[in-house]
């Protein structure tokens, strides 16, 4: 008889999860020679060890420490790009502006981007049927704890001027409950980070408001300033033009505002 399996509210582990993680690791270390020393089998073993056989609502940051250790990577000062609720544009930007890095441009973020995973207590099986949903089931699930752990580490190691892309189309442009608002903001190190520069990305073509005056941005400024980090904010009125101008900075239309 099939063994009883816990039913969660979220979608199950991404199909072919182990081979996807291993394949991504192999590809990443091949393409990024500075990470060539990484043993992908050890990375997968550490990743697996963080959630396999564990109750999926009781995962801790400690569980991911062996993986974090293996994936240690540093970003040059002034080159960290954080984002909140605007992943696609942030990734399009770093594809073009390669000397800037989002978390998903680093090994561990690259491995897990867009994937879901969880195990079951006391078995070596991966649960492909369902995984805990952050809201409906529990926050200490394997995926949420992973992103919290690697996001904390990413913010802790940032230095110089750190940039963050924020979605100006959302009701809360800065959301204290997002990973950026709850983890990254609080783990930037004032002794290493001189400033945080927010880029507020406008959604509508005709939207000429100064979203840097939004109350949630003022709240972000207050949090950052209290941590002795300077804060700057820029409106990006035309994200399409913004990307085009990153690609072709000499273009005459790029001398005017974006």
């Amino acid at each position: 008889l099939p063994r009883w399996r816990q039913q969660w509210s979220g979608s199950g582990t991404t199909s072919r999860f182990p081979e996807t993680v291993l394949a991504r690791c192999v590809k990443y270390t091949e393409v990024h020679p500075e990470m060539r020393h990484v043993d992908c089998q050890s990375v997968w073993d550490a990743f697996k060890g963080a959630f396999i056989s564990k109750y999926p609502c009781n995962i801790t940051e400690e569980d991911y420490q062996p993986l974090v250790k293996l994936g240690t990577q540093t970003v040059p000062c002034n080159k960290t790009l954080l984002w909140s609720r605007i992943k696609d544009l942030a990734h399009q930007f770093t594809q073009v502006q390669r000397d800037m890095f989002t978390l998903e441009d680093m090994l561990l973020g690259y491995l897990a981007d867009d994937l879901t995973w969880c195990g079951e207590f006391n078995t070596f099986e991966i649960n492909y049927q369902s995984c805990p949903d952050w809201r409906k089931d529990c926050s200490n699930n394997p995926v949420s704890v992973f992103w919290k752990t690697v996001s904390r580490r990413f913010a802790e190691t940032a230095c110089g001027v750190v940039h963050v892309m924020l979605n100006g189309s959302r009701s809360k442009i800065f959301d204290k409950n997002s990973t950026f608002g709850s983890v990254e903001v609080h783990n930037l190190q004032p002794e290493k980070v001189q400033a945080l520069e927010a880029w507020v990305i406008h959604g509508g073509r005709e939207d000429s408001r100064d979203l840097c005056q939004d109350p949630t941005i003022k709240e972000l400024e207050s949090i950052i300033s209290k941590r002795n980090i300077r804060f700057f904010c820029k409106n990006i009125y035309r994200p399409d033009k913004f990307l085009q101008c990153v690609k072709n900075p000499e273009d005459s239309s790029c001398l005017s505002g974006i």
Partner: antibody
Amino acid sequence: EVQLQQSGTVLARPGASVKMSCKASGYTFTRYWMHWVKQRPGQDLEWIGGFYPGNSDTRYNQKFKDKAKLTAVTSTSTAYMELSSLTNEDSAVYYCTRGDRHDEGFAYWGQGTLVTVSA
Amino acid sequence: DIQMTQSPASLSASVGETVTITCRASGNIHNYLAWYQQKQGKSPQLLVYNAKTLPDGVPSRFSGSGSGTQYSLKINSLQPEDFGTYYCQNIWTNYTFGGGTKLEIK
């Protein structure tokens, strides 16, 4: 703007060697793989190999391991490919092409260098 | 080495039609597949990477799908500028290209 400017057409004798260049501009040369691709007239594309200027890492298609040599001069942001012991089979257009951030596709291409091998 | 088998080798279609080109890899390439368009006498142009991601600037009528060893490129509502030769490429290992699909105006 990313640009890859390749050297001009080459006419060479069988048995000779040729060295073609690919000058890169508009990006940090040392941070991307530079690949080379062969296309014979009216034929398919063939990957020859890739070179990482940041540390001179090189990868070759086994078929071209003894045929092509990939190098680069970082001070001038120029990649080179030398083809040796030329035969008629080497008559083709050769493209230099740059990978994207994680080398998941060849996002930028040079205009191609035509090599004609003829006695 | 992984071989890439592309089909059909040629295809005639009219402006406004939808066409699909397929590519089969001889081994699992883990979604590391790219599609290119090449016009006569020009360099290839990247249309899709990671099997389904469109680079900035590629029209949304192009879409990629597939996984494992089977992949496809779909072009909705063909435009006059879409005619040319299409290649798939395995980006997983050794960057091998498919044999190409020549898309001609009917």
